[in-house]
């Protein structure tokens, strides 16, 4: 057995889940209900996080670890440890101050969170558009016409989407 904390220090030997009670000769006392200490040698226990409202409990609080929250359906976590819940939008939308708005032409969002991003510019890589972009999907780039050998069958272009994407030339 190798010591990790000093025996002569009345508080450092208190294990996780307890606190060093200065009012009672610095004995190690268990954390009161709805509080925790995740490390040894603590002088106080921290109050457990409560997952209320739009937050829901993912992991209950214990004497040695805090509760963990996530978000109710229709919302998603933001920030370290899910410090905020943000409203979901549909794919092809982004959240603005006025609520969920469709992605502008030339942008897409394939998730229920985050912002609309521009379609990939295939020509920057010397490629052509194989599949047009939509509000929900990025364009798919294919080989440039020069990559196709003579006599090779060319790709039949897809039917235009509701808002067909194009690669600026």
């Amino acid at each position: 057995f190798e010591r990790t904390r000093s025996l002569q220090d009345p508080c450092s030997n208190c294990p996780a889940g307890t606190f060093c009670d200065n009012n009672r000769n610095q004995i190690c006392s268990p954390c009161p209900p709805n509080s925790f200490s995740s490390a040894g040698g603590q002088r106080t226990c921290d109050i457990c996080r409560q997952c209320k409202g739009v937050f829901r409990t993912r992991k209950e609080c214990s004497s040695t670890s805090n509760a963990e929250c996530d978000c109710t359906p229709g919302f998603h976590c933001l920030g370290a440890g899910c410090s905020m819940c943000e409203q979901d939008c549909k794919q092809g939308q982004e959240l603005t101050k006025k609520g969920c708005k469709d992605c502008c032409f030339g942008t897409f969002n394939d998730q229920k969170r985050g912002i609309c991003r521009p379609w990939t510019n295939c020509s920057l890589d010397g490629k052509s558009v194989l599949v047009n972009g939509t509000k929900e999907r990025d364009v798919v780039c294919g080989p440039s016409p020069a990559d196709l050998s003579p006599g090779a069958s060319s790709v039949t272009p897809p039917a235009p989407a509701r808002e067909p994407g194009h690669s600026p030339q």
Epitope: F1, L7, D9, N13, N25, I27, C28
Partner: antibody, heavy 109, light 113 residues
Framework: VKESEGGLFKPTDTLTLACTVS????????ITWVRQAPGNGLEWIGV???????VYASWAKSRSTITRNTNLNTVTLKMTSLTAADTATYFC??????WGPGTLVTVSS | AAVLTQTPSPVSVTVGGTVTINCQAS????????LAWFQQKPGQPPKQLIY???TLASGVSSRFKGSGSGTQFTLTISGVQCDDAATYYC?????????????FGGGTEVVVK
Amino acid sequence: VKESEGGLFKPTDTLTLACTVSGFSLSYNAITWVRQAPGNGLEWIGVINYDGTTVYASWAKSRSTITRNTNLNTVTLKMTSLTAADTATYFCARNFNIWGPGTLVTVSS
Amino acid sequence: AAVLTQTPSPVSVTVGGTVTINCQASQSVDNNNYLAWFQQKPGQPPKQLIYSASTLASGVSSRFKGSGSGTQFTLTISGVQCDDAATYYCLGEFSASSGDWNAFGGGTEVVVK
């Protein structure tokens, strides 16, 4: 923190001392045993940690055992093969900051 | 096993004076500061004064001061009072590999005149 009564023992006897604690739980607090021969200094015997692990002084390891009963709030020191050199006041302490009054153990034929 | 040597013993001091007690370890204490000081009066259990070399234990007068690290440690009592007459012990904590986890010094008797 209080030690049980010591008393007179014969050489080769086995010593059993109990340390009873109140106001705190042994599940979270370490109890250490220390002894002091008459007119001499303090000598560390061993400790039982809050998790039940034990550590002993090298001289005590072969003939000492420290156990605990967390329900009864007692820690027991058992020392075998007593000799006159084991005559001492035996103390138990929570870590080293709360001490019992001590109990005198005399080993004599 | 580690050995703690205390000097001087005994030591005499007048009321209001200052006394210094030294404790030297044969090897470094754990964390370089796992050393405590205790006061013991006849017929009583020891009382912890200092832990972690320099931290004053709860309820102990600030006249007691601990210092040092590694193998050399000092307890200084300033403004000595009659009630300070006692034997003082240092206690070192060592790594388990040293053979003994805890070891006391031999004690220093302080006589107050």
